[in-house]
């Protein structure tokens, strides 16, 4: 009878083990070990027993001890089980973005590791176990499917192998893959809301606002705003799960016509977009022409208004007859027409909307000078010592210069408050002078003495 000790060994891959072979008789004819492993006989030993050191054990093996005693030949095997932790434990890459509400499949690839019967693969979310399965096959792939919610955003998923050798070497060997962080997103099925002018005039500035609710994570959302080929640069305001993108838009004559305004909100792997038509138009202000902007009184003046070919004009509130882009009328200039405004209002229909433009011109009428009784009375009677303000207004365009002198030297203080004295009494010659000539008028000041009262 041949004995072997230990009959079973579990050892790390590449490790060594000492095995004792012994014979049942005192003086065996033969005592040895049969194994393909590198082996060395080591001390101690005896006549009927030998110690062997088996080294670099790479795989499971069953070395055999044999002995030849007078009562016959026999053999005994020792079972060597090699253990080693997996060479590769890898969680397959997660999608860059995972939509909320859609199931996620986690895949863990495990290469190597033995004994397989003691190898378990655990899929984890953070520290929480999602699934636990045995590793089957030389190169195992373990999968599990998990529903994805908003709270999974930023969660770390990993895969762990457990080589449980606690029944043998009181050890649990763990290998954990590098964690992969999940990015989840939620983009509603509703398109963004786009608020913008339907019509936009060339060389003017308009404001476009694009907003969308129900986004997660809102900070990761991107907004693309464009009018035709012109990409806009919006300022984005974020709410809890909403965003609002506001941009200014200025258009040029080259863009005249119908343009597409696009707002696209991109989140994760999805996009929601809204398109709107904006009509770009050019509408210069109407022209108001006067034959001459400055005329002498009595001169005939033609007032003319001309606008965009498709516009309809009104001149001083009177529509053109027939309705169209031109209107005019003729007047004889009077002093009352000086400073008179002539207003032309043009109306253009753009994409069903009416847009208005106004232009105003002022007429200057040259007249005078004039000194009227109404504005420059010829006779003043004032009590002596009273406070009075002599008034005399000369009219004309250009505005005349006014002087009122008594005896050619003593001025009447026009427009100034004075205390009436005897010296003030007399006849003054008021002279209004402008580039258009001069007029004179006599003004008499009477002073009443208190004794006459």
């Amino acid at each position: 009878q041949t004995s072997v000790f230990p009959p079973e060994v579990i050892l790390p891959r590449g490790g060594s083990v000492k095995v004792n072979c012994s014979a049942s008789c005192d003086q065996p004819i033969l005592l040895g070990m049969e194994t393909p492993l590198p082996k060395k006989e080591i001390l101690p030993g005896g006549n009927n027993w030998k110690m062997y050191e088996l080294s670099n054990v790479q795989e499971d093996s069953q070395p055999m001890c044999y002995s030849n005693c007078p009562d016959g030949q026999s053999a005994a095997k020792t079972v060597l089980t090699v253990y080693w932790t997996p060479e590769r434990v890898e969680l397959a890459p997660l999608p860059p973005w995972q939509p909320v509400g859609k199931n996620l499949t986690l895949r863990c690839q495990v290469e190597g590791g033995a004994p397989r019967a003691n190898l378990t693969v655990v899929l984890l979310r953070g520290e929480k176990e999602l699934s636990r399965q045995s590793a089957v096959g030389e190169s195992a792939e373990v999968t599990t499917t998990v529903p994805v919610g908003r709270d999974d955003h930023g969660a770390n998923f990993s895969c762990r192998t457990e080589l449980d050798l606690r029944p043998y070497v009181l050890k649990l060997f763990e290998n954990t893959s590098a964690p992969h962080q999940l990015q989840t997103f939620d983009l509603p099925a509703t398109p963004p809301q786009l608020v913008s002018p339907q019509v936009l005039e060339v060389d003017t500035q308009g404001t476009v606002v694009c907003s969308l609710d129900g986004l997660f994570p809102v900070s990761e959302a991107q907004v693309y705003l464009a009018l035709g080929d012109q990409k806009l640069n919006p300022t984005i305001t974020y709410g809890d799960n909403s965003l609002s993108a506001k941009a200014s838009v200025k258009v040029t004559a080259e863009e005249e016509g119908t343009q597409q305004l696009l707002c696209a909100v991109m989140l994760g792997t999805q996009t929601q977009e809204t398109r709107q038509t904006v009509t770009i138009y050019s509408f210069p202000a109407p022209n108001v022409n006067l034959t001459k902007p400055e005329v002498s009184e009595g001169t005939e003046v033609i007032v003319e208004c001309e606008a965009h070919p498709r516009a309809k004009v009104m001149l001083n509130g009177v529509p053109a007859q027939p309705p169209g882009p031109r209107a005019q009328f003729v007047l004889k200039a009077t002093p009352e027409d000086n400073g008179r405004s002539f207003s032309c209002s043009a109306t253009l229909e753009v994409a069903g909307q009416l847009v208005h433009k106004n232009q105003t011109r002022e007429l200057r009428v040259l007249y005078g000078p004039r000194l009227d009784e109404k504005d420059c009375p010829g006779n003043w009677t004032w009590p002596e010592n009273s406070q009075q303000t002599p008034m005399c207004q000369a009219w004309g365009n250009p505005l005349p210069q006014l002087k009122c002198l008594k005896d050619g030297t003593f001025p009447l203080p026009i427009g100034q408050s004075v205390t009436v004295t005897r010296d003030l009494e007399g006849t003054y010659l008021c002279q209004a002078r402008s580039t258009r000539g001069e007029v004179t008028r006599e003004v008499t000041v009477n002073v009443l003495s208190p004794r006459y009262e």
């Epitope: 082996k39 101690p44 030998k50």
Partner: antibody, heavy 121, light 107 residues
């Protein structure tokens, strides 16, 4: 560092018993795997292994001298003692003690300087 | 019991390679060690476990062991290497030494 030193009589008469002591330092005979052995070398001849004692107090002897040899240890004193009975002039030799760092592999990594024992009447 | 056989002497020119053999039945199944002994001194371990070198032993000393023969190789032999060399193995539970080889460095 590891050191070993042999001590005992330089001259022994035939039929007497030789007692040799190996005093060591730098290691302990209570350390698993360690052992101390004795080797002798007659003048101008080869080395001859005599005996070995290990940390577990297991003792091994040369088959040809087994009946005459006894090896023992005093772990607390860091000493190993070899006695050899019935000495004969052919036992004249330099006696060495040496350390086995791993007895299972049988090599001796550090040797004492040796002590010459002459057997003569 | 196993017997270890060594050539009594080996000569080598300085700088050349010296090889000392040690043969014994199935010696490759056991570990072999080598010791260097200079006149009047205790042996010094130069190779253990067939091919391992203790610290302090020059790299020119190397060993191998397979089949029935263990070999000590000294490459680039120097004058100071002149000594007696003993191989050692075991036949459980006996420890066995070879008869020794005198290495002479010529010149």
């Amino acid at each position: 560092q590891v050191q070993l030193k042999e001590s005992g009589p330089a001259l022994v008469k035939p039929t007497q018993t030789l007692t040799l002591t190996c005093t060591f330092s730098g290691f302990s005979l209570s350390t698993s795997g360690v052992g101390v052995g004795w080797i002798r070398q007659p003048p101008g001849k080869a080395l001859e292994w005599l005996a070995l004692i290990d940390w577990d107090d297991d003792k091994y002897y040369s088959t040809s001298l087994k009946t005459r040899l006894t090896i023992s240890k005093d772990t607390s004193k860091n000493q190993v003692v070899l006695t050899m009975t019935n000495m004969d002039p052919v036992d004249t030799a330099t006696y060495y003690c040496a350390r086995y760092p791993v007895t299972q592999r049988s090599y001796m990594d550090v040797w004492g300087q040796g002590t010459l024992v002459t057997v003569s009447s | 019991d196993i017997e270890l056989t060594q050539p009594p002497s080996v000569s080598v020119a300085p700088g050349q390679t010296a090889r000392i053999s040690c043969s014994g039945d199935a010696l490759g199944d056991k570990y072999a060690s080598w010791y260097q002994q200079k006149p009047g001194q205790a042996p010094v371990l130069v190779i253990y476990d067939d091919s391992d070198r203790p610290s302090g032993i020059p790299e020119r000393f190397s060993g191998s062991n397979s089949g029935n023969t263990a070999t000590l190789t000294i490459s680039g032999t120097q004058a100071e290497d002149e000594a007696d060399y003993y191989c050692q193995s075991y036949d459980s539970p006996q420890v066995v030494f070879g008869g020794g080889t005198k290495l002479t460095v010529l010149g």
